[in-house]
């Protein structure tokens, strides 16, 4: 009489995470009497996956009704597959023994590989803002994918970047993998509206890569340029001095007027105008009563932008009987600020 053989026809099975894996196994004989068990791995540390005889295996169902007398199909289904389920599964026939059943014959094994999608890439930029011409680093991370092969690309405004380094961990065999990439980006003054994109392509994504983005508006700081100008007003004893704050980002800005070094007014940028490149302009006016001064006045526009050290621009106001226009304001976007007279 031919000896029982345990047949596992599939050398390998590939299943997407979340789906059900079918592991096939048939015996060639009903004899010897005894149960079938499924294990993951071989040797003393093997993990019991299913025992026909006893136990509770909520994720496992049998393909056939094992209580039927002539059943020789011991295939199983494992539901809700995760990358942790990857491994080689063995269908093992036991023969009844005293007091314990004895392993009789094992199948050749079926390797279960799990295809798991990478998580959505998360792009993070530097902790502190940087100014144009500086190089900043962005990182991109994605986790939980299998198999290990993966492609990562960086883009800035649709243009592919080349200065980046990528690592896939772990280096050896694992149930799932993670990717970590760092890209270097040189900032320009026009980058307020720019985006950095990390794109991950994997076999599980069927040609539709995942993308993570970072807005450079959260990374860049464009320092303002200052221009102080003076023009006459209708009242002969008053002079209008304007401080034009141009091309700054972000909006957080505080302006202080100094008169001969003494603080005369401090205000915070509120009603700003936005340029096409995403930077802002703002203008502050100071109305100076010339008659209150016998000597020339040094007016200083001091700006503290985004918590950085203050920058300033000064203007010497000549006190004379007939003040002349000493500069013109050509900025079309001026919105002005609170008008205050200094007496």
């Amino acid at each position: 009489e031919e000896e029982l053989q345990v047949i596992q026809p599939d050398k390998s099975v590939l299943v997407a995470a979340g789906e059900t894996a079918t592991l096939r196994c048939t015996a060639t004989s009903l004899i010897p009497v005894g149960p079938i068990q499924w294990f993951r791995g071989a040797g003393p540390g093997r993990e019991l996956i299913y025992n026909q005889k006893e136990g509770h295996f909520p994720r496992v169902t049998t393909v056939s009704d094992l209580t039927k007398r002539n059943n020789m199909d011991f295939s199983i289904r494992i539901g809700n597959i995760t990358p942790a389920d990857a491994g080689t599964y063995y269908c093992v026939k036991f023969r009844k023994g005293s007091p314990d059943d004895v392993e009789f014959k094992s199948g050749a094994g079926t390797e279960l590989s799990v295809r798991a999608k990478p998580s959505a890439p998360v792009v993070s930029g530097p902790a502190a803002r940087a100014t144009p011409q500086h190089t900043v680093s962005f990182t991109c991370e994605s986790h939980g994918f299998s198999p290990r092969d993966i492609t990562l690309k960086w883009f800035k405004n649709g243009n592919e970047l080349s200065d980046f380094q990528t690592n896939v961990d772990p280096v050896g065999e694992s149930v799932s993998y993670s990717i970590h990439s760092t890209a270097k980006v040189v900032l320009t003054r026009e980058d307020v509206h720019s985006q950095v994109i990390c794109e991950v392509a994997h076999v599980t994504l069927q040609g539709d890569p995942l993308r993570g983005t970072a807005n450079l508006s959260e990374t860049i700081r464009v320092p303002p340029t200052l221009e102080v100008t003076q023009q006459p007003v209708r009242a002969e004893n008053q002079v209008n001095v304007t401080c034009q704050v141009r091309k700054f980002y972000p909006q957080r800005l505080q302006l202080t007027w100094l008169e001969n070094g003494n603080v005369s007014r401090t205000e915070t940028a509120s009603t700003v105008t936005e340029n096409k490149d995403g930077t802002y302009n703002w203008m502050s006016w100071l109305l100076v009563n010339v008659s209150a001064h016998r000597d020339d006045v040094k007016l200083t526009c001091q700006v503290e932008h985004d918590g950085q050290p203050a920058v300033s621009k000064s203007h010497d106001l000549k006190v004379s009987a007939h003040p002349k226009e000493q500069g013109s304001n050509t900025a079309a976007e001026n919105t002005g600020s609170n008008e205050r007279n200094i007496y």
């Epitope: 009903l30 009497v33 009704d65 209580t67 002539n70 009844k96």
Partner: antibody, heavy 131, light 103 residues
Amino acid sequence: AVTLDESGGGLQTPGGALSLVCKASGFTFNSYNMGWVRQAPGKGLEFVAGIYSAGGDTSTTYGAAVNGRATISRDNGQSTVRLQLNNLRAEDTGIYFCAKAAGGCTAHNCDAYIADSIDAWGHGTEVIVSS
Amino acid sequence: AVTQPASVSANLGETVKITCSGDSSYYGWYQQKAPGSAPVTLIYDNDKRPSNIPSRFSGSKSGSTATLTITGVQADDEAVYYCGNEDMNYVGIFGAGTTLTVL
């Protein structure tokens, strides 16, 4: 007619061994699964051991209470099935019935098991384990 | 494990059903009129009846529950009824028995 005659019962001492024999007639013995069922005083039926028609030690099965102490065997030429029970205990006391299944099991086909398909019983032999 | 009711009762001539539940595909039903006496097979393989058993005894199985039906119960039917099956380890199991009382 199918007849099953048990023998070998009687008074046994604890720790000893007994050998029960069932002599079958009236059917093609080697085509059928055979088994032993017992009944302790005041208790229900209990499966003791079974042997499939395929024969050999690879086609035997034992109840939990006797597993490791019992051996069932068959002699198709003599149409007998034997139950050997070692290390006897007081709880082995009872009537031991020989049972014939309605079919047999070969390597590739099983018409019957035992407890779900007994179609003939012997009259039983009484075993008393006592010192 | 096999579960069956400890006792059932029926009036003479009535139909009585005894159930047995367990994790198996096949069940047998055995009648024992006195403790220690040889059991009699009423039904094997769920619904097969030996030729010497009256047709008022019938067996059926639905899902994991087997049922022995006795139609037109007679006084002589008073006995203990056992169901038997095989567990997943090919070991025979018998229920604890159901005592039928005919009123």
